[in-house]
């Protein structure tokens, strides 16, 4: 009976240093197999003693055509089990197998970590035929190895729908430590502890970490990767980096700046964009944020007037946009305006103060003692009033606006007249007879039109009626006077 010899496949431990059945090389490793005697390669790296049972999948060949003798089971010959080399070196390794000539169309494929290697790989298969068997040597070469070439490589051969698999060849590419996590720049609160993390990998392992703060080593002894540095607090900006060491050498991380959060710098360039009688639109350029986002800003407004009590009005606003409309101001007044902004640490100093003025306002009171009477001979209405007691902020009086509304039998018509500031009387032509005329007067400044006086009504009779009694607004009452004829 034919028995199948098998052995437990044990994974090779991945640690630096030569292993039984391993090749450590820092030069080009060319496991070349010249054709010397028949198909037997001359140079083989064998981790096993002679006569060691073969491993991997074995194909049990069928009986020969004559039916007289059995062929030995097919298996790949043992080769080097573990190749250790430095990054950027070249490596070549191979599988070999002797296949009886009765088998046709034998192909060998290379696999890495369970995936077939296809395409642009340097795989060469050479055949060395003999009388009864053909030696097949499949070579795989990698130029300038990288870490990504690390892994377990095997050969597979299909024969009669059977698959023969070689022992794995472990390729371990060693190099300088490679950072998988580096410290990050941060903005921190003064005298408050924070953490930085550094992680680097080989192979070779172990990777040891040294922390550097402002060019001074923080830890005198190496710490295993990954390492978390608890910085006990800073009073000023500092630069941190970490050094990763392994047997191949040293890699230094990027240096990161740790900033200390502070109050913001004051805003600059406070500008006036628009002024009205009661509002001023300002903008500003934010100062440096102190390594902490702005939360809000405060607009401070002081009236520049020797008679004012010097109190400051404060208007809070969001930090963005850098613009604010100050409202509820007095007309024709001078103000000093400053801006301050805050972050989580506190308020900035106030910006340089700027002067701004509101424009003239409209009058706030109506003309007084409005009287209206009919001058029938001239067919007009005489209107008289007293100049209102306007505040300085309303600006200079430029005139008056007279509104007269004529109402009769379902018809209503409003007319407006403008008169100069020196006048305190006006005459308007009668528009309609047998009608009511309602008169209101407002003072006008550059700032606008003030409130209209209370309406004064006068009845305009049909032709032939004579009455010179005036209608008037009492001063200062708010009755609705009507001339009763």
């Amino acid at each position: 009976a034919i028995t199948e010899a098998r052995e437990e496949a044990k994974p090779y431990p991945l640690f630096p240093g030569p292993l039984p059945g391993s090749l450590q090389t820092d030069h080009t490793s060319l496991l070349s197999l010249p054709h010397t005697s028949g198909y037997q390669p001359a140079l083989m790296f064998s981790p096993t003693q002679p006569g060691r049972p073969y491993t991997g999948n074995v194909a049990i060949p069928r009986v020969t055509s004559a039916g007289s003798k059995l062929l030995p089971p097919l298996a790949f010959k043992h080769t080097v089990g573990h190749i250790i080399l430095s990054e950027h070196k070249d490596v070549k390794f191979n599988c070999s197998i002797s296949v009886p000539n009765i088998y046709q169309d034998t192909t060998i494929s290379w696999w890495k970590d369970g995936k077939e290697l296809l395409g642009a790989h340097h795989a060469i298969t050479q055949f060395y035929p003999d009388d009864e068997v053909t030696a097949i040597i499949a070579s795989f070469s990698i130029t300038s190895v990288q870490r990504s070439d690390n892994g377990s490589y095997i050969c597979k051969m299909k024969i009669n729908n059977e698959e023969i698999v070689s022992d794995p060849i472990y390729i371990e590419v060693q190099g300088l430590p490679h950072f998988t996590k580096q410290p990050e720049s941060m903005n921190v609160t003064r005298n408050t502890a924070f953490n930085l993390t550094c992680q680097a990998v080989g192979p070779p392992e172990p990777v040891n970490i040294f922390w550097v703060q402002n060019s001074s080593r923080v830890n005198e002894q190496p710490e295993k990767s990954p390492s978390v540095l608890t910085v006990p607090g800073l009073t000023e900006m500092a630069v941190f980096s970490c050094e990763a060491h392994n047997d191949k050498g040293l890699t230094v991380s990027k240096g990161v700046q740790i900033n200390i959060k502070a109050i913001p710098s004051p805003p600059t360039e406070v500008s006036i964009h628009n002024s009205t009688a009661h509002s001023i639109l300002i903008s500003w350029v934010p100062g440096f944020d102190g390594y902490s986002p702005f939360r809000n800003c405060s607009v401070q407004v002081k009236e520049v007037d020797p008679l004012s009590n010097g109190s400051v009005m404060i208007f809070n606003t969001s930090a963005s946009p850098h613009m604010y409309q100050i409202k509820q101001l007095q007309a024709l007044a001078n103000y000093s305006i400053g801006v301050s902004c805050m972050n989580e640490i506190g308020w900035s100093a106030v910006s340089p103060w700027i002067l701004a003025s509101t424009t003239e306002g409209a009058p706030s009171v109506a003309p007084l003692n409005v009287t209206v009477f009919l001058n029938e001979s001239r067919d007009n209405v005489d209107i008289r009033w007293m100049k209102p007691l306007t505040k300085r902020q309303a600006g200079e009086l430029v005139g008056y606006r007279i509104s007269h509304v004529w109402q009769s039998a379902g018809i209503s018509k409003e007319l407006l007249e403008e008169v100069g500031q020196n006048n305190s009387r006006a005459q308007i032509s009668v528009q309609v007879h047998n009608a009511t005329c309602t008169v209101r007067i407002a003072a006008v400044t550059k700032g606008g039109v003030g409130p209209f006086s209370d309406p004064v009504k006068i009845f305009i009779p049909a032709h032939g009626w004579v009455d010179h009694a005036p209608s008037s607004t009492p001063a200062p009452g708010n009755a609705d006077p009507v001339l009763i004829i």
Partner: antibody, heavy 118, light 106 residues
């Protein structure tokens, strides 16, 4: 708990040698350096240097080179300070300390008094 | 070598009083550690990295400072606080100690 236990007091003649031991317990010995600090009678603390317990490499402060040797036996978590050709001015209490990040000495031995007198 | 100068050399105070100890460095240092030593005893860690209390140290002790100027403050002296206090710098080798400040009972 972390402990550093030093060997007992020594009385030596000038020209002799002395070896002070410092046995560490309660932590992984090779993770922290061992520093040595001298305190002469009535004087302040003077840093002598330290030994890297991971590599065995010693670092000596100025004035402590030549006659002073730091060594280790990691198998028994012990650091040693050896002083040769002793002089009267070597009379002092010698402390071993555990060094951590930022050169902070967080644990101290109880001190070993070395008296050099003829 | 960074030289650390502690002042005053001696501070005479009564229990309950506030003690302010100064340590000046000849050039800027990253952190300052403080140790307390009583007669016949080994030094004991007090303040780590300028302002962090070592384990078991009461809150009446505090540390502050930056650059070349560092301070240890004891807000209200207790009888057990009368001792010698040393500062020690971290920045560059060698690791130097200050000359010490003795806090004695007035």
């Amino acid at each position: 708990q972390v402990q550093l236990v030093q060997s007992g007091s020594e009385l030596k003649k000038p020209g002799a040698s002395v070896k002070v031991s410092c046995k560490a317990s309660g932590y992984t010995f090779t993770n922290y350096g061992v520093h040595w600090v001298r305190q002469a009678p009535g004087q302040g603390l003077e840093w002598m240097g330290w030994i890297n317990t991971y590599t065995g490499e010693p670092t000596y402060a100025q004035g402590f080179t030549g006659r002073f040797v730091f060594s280790l036996d990691t198998s028994v978590s012990t650091a040693y300070l050896q002083i040769s050709s002793l002089k009267a001015e070597d009379t002092a209490v010698y402390y071993c300390t555990r060094g951590t990040r930022y050169a902070y000495m967080d644990y101290w031995g109880q001190g070993t008094l070395v008296t050099v007198s003829s | 070598e960074i030289v650390l100068t502690q002042s005053p050399a001696t501070l005479s105070l009564s229990p309950g009083e506030r003690a302010t100890l100064s340590c000046r460095a000849s050039s800027s240092v990253g952190y300052m550690h403080w140790y307390q030593q009583k007669p016949g005893q080994a030094p004991r860690p007090l303040i780590y990295a300028t302002s962090n209390l070592a384990s078991g140290i009461p809150a009446r002790f505090s540390g502050s400072g930056s650059g070349t100027s560092y301070t240890l403050t004891i807000s209200s002296l207790e009888p057990e606080d009368f001792a010698v206090y040393y500062c020690q710098q971290w920045s560059s080798n060698p690791r130097t100690f200050g000359g010490g400040t003795k806090v004695e009972i007035k």
